[in-house]
C-alpha cells in the first residue's frame, strides 16, 4: 500500500523534472541551493539553477545521455562545488567538496546556519515593489524564494512554493488596486508571520528527525494524525505516518525534489482515500495541488467515533498485554498511542508522547516482574500528574496573560527565562521570550478543550528555536541538558529550571543603556524590542532584582523615551535624561 513504490528510473533528474514540471523544478533547485549556500548572491544561484535545468532537459530528451544516471546529490553537489568563492565565503564548508557522496551532502547539511549573518529584510515602498513585480515577475518571485530560503535553511520547500504562489497573487491583485498599500501590506504582513511560524514548525520536525531519530518523528506523527483522523483505522494511520516520515526525511535532508514529488503523491493518496481517513478533507481535495497539500496539513480534527471502547480493556486489564508487547513492541506502543490520541484531541502531542513513554517504561519493568498484571494494573493512575501539570501551567499563564496583556506578559517571561539561563545571548532571549509570550494571544482565547494542544505544542516549536540557536554557540549546560535529554520533556525541563545561582552577574556597561533619538522613529514593535533588550540586560546585571524593582525601572524607562521623543531637541534630551535614568536605575537596583 506504499504510495512511494516507484519503478527504477534510468535518470533521476529527468524523472523529477517530468514529475514536477519545469517551473516547480527550477523553484525547488533554487530553494535547495539557497538553503545550502546561504551567503551566495542571487545572480550566482540563478546561474547555477539555469545550468542544472538545461542539463535536466537534455536528460529528459535522452535518459542515457552522459551523467544523466548520476544521483541528484552528486549532480547538485558537483554544481555547488563549482562556486569560485566557496573557501573565502564559507571557510571550512569548502572542505565538504573534497568528500564523496553521501558524506559530502551530510557535510553540507551540517553547515546549514539557523542564524546566518544576513541583513534584515527591509520592505521597499509599495510602488517600488509593484514596479519591480511588473518589470520582471519571474525574477521578482525567484528573489522571494531565494531570500526566504537562505534565511530559513530548513523551510519546508513544497510549502515555500505555496507561499510564493500567495505572494504572487497578492502583488497581482494589489498592484492594480486603487490603494495599493492598504491592499498589499496586510497581505505581506500575514505572509511574513505565517512564514515565520511555518519555518519554526518545520525546524522542529527536522530537529526531531536529526537529533532524536525516525522513531521519535514517527511517534509524533502517530499522535498528531490520530488526533486529526480519529475515524481512520490504525493501519491507515500507520501508512500515512510512514509516507509522511519519508517526505519530511527527504526535505530535512535537502532532497527537495523527491520531497515535493512525494508530498504531491501523498496528497493524492489521501484524497483518493478520504472516506477511510476523514470527513473533513472534502474541501481540501477540491483545491489545486499546492493549496491542497497545505489545506490537508492544516485540516481540523475529524469528529471522534461514537462508542469508542475503554482503553483499559486492551492495555491494562488484558492478560495478553505483555505477550502483545513482547511480540512487537513498537507496533503495540503505536497502537496505544493511536488509541489514546484519537480519544484525546484535548491533549498536546507532547503530553500524549509522555504518556506513551510512561506506559512503555511501566511495561518494560512489569513484564519482567513475577506478577506483571498486578505490577501494571495502576499504570493509568501514573498519567494523572502528567496531565495535570500542563493543565495547571496553562491555566496560570493564561490568567497572567489576561491580567498583563501581551507586551507585559512577554516581559514577565523575559525576566523568568533570563534568570533561568542568563548565559544565553540577549537577542536570543528577546526573540525566544517574545515568541513564548505570543502563546497568550494565540491560545488563551480558545476553550479549555483546545488550549493545551495549542499552547504546549506551540511552546515546543518556540523552545526548539532556542535549542537550535543555542546549539550553534553553546553557552549554558542547562540549556544543552533540556534540549538534548528528551524531545517531549523540553518544556517541562525549562519550566522546572529555577534561578541560576551559579551565574556571575554581568559587569555594568552604561553604553548598553544609552539610547538615541532614532528610537522615536521606530515602529511600535521595534521600540518594544529595544525596551525588552534593555530589560534582559538589567536582569543579567542584577539577577536578584525583584519584580517590583524591575517594573519601576522599566516604567521610568518608558516615561523617559516618551518624554524625549516629544522634546524639541530629542538627541540632547536622550543624552542628558539618559544619564539621569542610568544613575537612578543603578540606585534603584543597588548596582
Amino acid at each position: 500500500r506504499g504510495v512511494f513504490r516507484r519503478d527504477a528510473h534510468k535518470s533521476e533528474v529527468a524523472h523529477r523534472f517530468k514529475d514536477l514540471g519545469e517551473e516547480n523544478f527550477k523553484a525547488l533547485v533554487l530553494i535547495a541551493f539557497a538553503q545550502y549556500l546561504q551567503q551566495c548572491p542571487f545572480e550566482d544561484h540563478v546561474k547555477l539553477v539555469n545550468e542544472v535545468t538545461e542539463f535536466a532537459k537534455t536528460c529528459v530528451a535522452d535518459e542515457s545521455a552522459e551523467n544523466c544516471d548520476k544521483s541528484l546529490h552528486t549532480l547538485f553537489g558537483d554544481k555547488l562545488c563549482t562556486v569560485a568563492t566557496l573557501r573565502e565565503t564559507y571557510g571550512e564548508m569548502a572542505d565538504c567538496c573534497a568528500k564523496q557522496e553521501p558524506e559530502r551532502n551530510e557535510c553540507f547539511l551540517q553547515h546549514k546556519d539557523d542564524n546566518p549573518n544576513l541583513p534584515r529584510l527591509v520592505r521597499p515602498e509599495v510602488d517600488v515593489m509593484c514596479t519591480a513585480f511588473h518589470d520582471n515577475e519571474e525574477t521578482f518571485l525567484k528573489k522571494y524564494l531565494y531570500e526566504i530560503a537562505r534565511r530559513h535553511p530548513y523551510f519546508y520547500a513544497p510549502e515555500l512554493l505555496f507561499f510564493a504562489k500567495r505572494y504572487k497573487a497578492a502583488f497581482t491583485e494589489c498592484c492594480q488596486a486603487a490603494d495599493k498599500a492598504a491592499c498589499l501590506l496586510p497581505k505581506l504582513d500575514e505572509l511574513r508571520d505565517e512564514g515565520k511560524a511555518s519555518s519554526a514548525k518545520q525546524r522542529l520536525k527536522c530537529a526531531s528527525l536529526q537529533k532524536f531519530g525516525e522513531r521519535a518523528f514517527k511517534a509524533w506523527a502517530v499522535a498528531r494524525l490520530s488526533q486529526r483522523f480519529p475515524k481512520a483505522e490504525f493501519a491507515e494511520v500507520s501508512k500515512l505516518v510512514t509516507d509522511l516520515t519519508k517526505v519530511h526525511t527527504e526535505c530535512c535532508h535537502g532532497d527537495l525534489l523527491e520531497c515535493a514529488d512525494d508530498r504531491a503523491d501523498l496528497a493524492k493518496y489521501i484524497c483518493e482515500n478520504q472516506d477511510s481517513i476523514s470527513s473533513k478533507l472534502k474541501e481540501c481535495c477540491e483545491k489545486p495541488l499546492l493549496e491542497k497539500s497545505h489545506c490537508i496539513a492544516e485540516v481540523e480534527n475529524d469528529e471522534m467515533p461514537a462508542d469508542l471502547p475503554s482503553l483499559a480493556a486492551d492495555f491494562v486489564e488484558s492478560k495478553d498485554v505483555c505477550k502483545n508487547y513482547a511480540e512487537a513492541k513498537d507496533v503495540f506502543l503505536g497502537m496505544f498511542l493511536y488509541e489514546y490520541a484519537r480519544r484525546h484531541p484535548d491533549y498536546s502531542v507532547v503530553l500524549l508522547l509522555r504518556l506513551a513513554k510512561t506506559y512503555e517504561t511501566t511495561l518494560e519493568k512489569c513484564c519482567a516482574a513475577a506478577d506483571p498484571h498486578e505490577c501494571y494494573a495502576k499504570v493509568f493512575d501514573e498519567f494523572k500528574p502528567l496531565v495535570e501539570e500542563p493543565q495547571n501551567l496553562i491555566k496560570q499563564n493564561c490568567e497572567l496573560f489576561e491580567q498583563l496583556g501581551e507586551y507585559k506578559f512577554q516581559n514577565a517571561l523575559l525576566v523568568r527565562y533570563t534568570k533561568k539561563v542568563p548565559q544565553v545571548s540577549t537577542p536570543t532571549l528577546v526573540e525566544v521570550s517574545r515568541n513564548l509570550g505570543k502563546v497568550g494571544s494565540k491560545c488563551c482565547k480558545h476553550p479549555e478543550a483546545k488550549r493545551m494542544p495549542c499552547a504546549e505544542d506551540y511552546l515546543s516549536v518556540v523552545l526548539n528555536q532556542l535549542c537550535v540557536l543555542h546549539e550553534k554557540t553553546p553557552v549554558s549546560d542547562r540549556v544543552t541538558k533540556c534540549c538534548t535529554e528528551s524531545l517531549v520533556n523540553r518544556r517541562p525541563c525549562f519550566s522546572a529550571l529555577e534561578v541560576d545561582e551559579t551565574y556571575v552577574p554581568k559587569e555594568f556597561n552604561a553604553e548598553t543603556f544609552t539610547f538615541h533619538a532614532d528610537i522615536c522613529t521606530l515602529s511600535e514593535k521595534e521600540r518594544q524590542i529595544k525596551k525588552q533588550t534593555a530589560l534582559v540586560e538589567l536582569v543579567k546585571h542584577k539577577p536578584k532584582a525583584t519584580k517590583e524593582q524591575l517594573k519601576a525601572v522599566m516604567d521610568d524607562f518608558a516615561a523617559f523615551v516618551e518624554k524625549c521623543c516629544k522634546a524639541d531637541d530629542k538627541e540632547t534630551c536622550f543624552a542628558e535624561e539618559g544619564k539621569k535614568l542610568v544613575a537612578a536605575s543603578q540606585a534603584a537596583l543597588g548596582l
Epitope: D307, P309, S310, A312, A313, D314, E317, S318, D320, N324
Partner: antibody, heavy 121, light 111 residues
Framework: EVQLVESGGGLVQPGGSLRLSCAAS????????MGWVRQAPGKCLEYIGI???????YYASWAKGRFTISRDNSKNTVYLQMNSLRAEDTATYFC???????????????WGQGTLVTVSS | DIQMTQSPSSLSASVGDRVTITCQSS????????LSWYQQKPGQPPKLLIY???DLASGVPSRFSGSGSGTDFTLTISSLQPEDFATYYC???????????FGCGTKLTVL
Amino acid sequence: EVQLVESGGGLVQPGGSLRLSCAASGFSLSSNAMGWVRQAPGKCLEYIGIISVGGFTYYASWAKGRFTISRDNSKNTVYLQMNSLRAEDTATYFCARDRHGGDSSGAFYLWGQGTLVTVSS
Amino acid sequence: DIQMTQSPSSLSASVGDRVTITCQSSESVYSNNQLSWYQQKPGQPPKLLIYDASDLASGVPSRFSGSGSGTDFTLTISSLQPEDFATYYCAGGFSSSSDTAFGCGTKLTVL
C-alpha cells in the same frame, strides 16, 4: 432485545472460503471482546479465537493462518473469514460475547444460535 | 496444546440428586480461577452457568455452584431438577487468550 445473530453459513467445497457474520442488536459490540466457537455435529465445543474491543485478535493454534476475525463497530458486526476449508471444518459456528473486553476469559455469557457450515464436494 | 479433561463423560441421575462433575486442566488456569461452566441442550447454544470458578452467572439458579483452583475444578448441582438434564462443558482461560480451551463435555441423563 439483546441478541447475536450469525449468518453466512452454507455448503462450500473443500479448499473454498467463507465469511461468517455476527450481528449484534440491543447492545454495542465495542464494549466486549467477541469470540467464535464451533461444534462439529455431535462433538465437543472448540474455541476458534477472539477479537478484543481494540481489535487485538487471538486464535487457537490450529486456527492461526486459515481463520481471521475482524470487527466493524459502525455496523455492530463481527466477522469470521475462513479460508482453505476442509471436511473437518464442518460444524455449527457460534459467535459469543466474552465477559472481558481486552482478552478471552473463557466466560462467554451471550451466544448466537449458530450457523451451519458444511464442507463437502 | 492445553487439555481440559472432564469426568465423567456421561452420567445418569434422578431428580433431587446431588451431582458433581469435575474438570482438570493440563496447566493452571489464569489467576488460578479463570474457569467457566456451561450447560447445553440439543439444538441450542451453550449457556454460561459459572465464571471465575465459583461466581454464578446472572439468572442461574443457586443450586448450581462451582469450586476449585489452579488445575482442578468441580461443578455441583445440589438438587437436580428436570430441566437440568443436558450436556455440561468446562472452559478454561489461560495466560494467553490464544489458549482458551473447552472440555469435551459431560452428558447428564435421566436415570
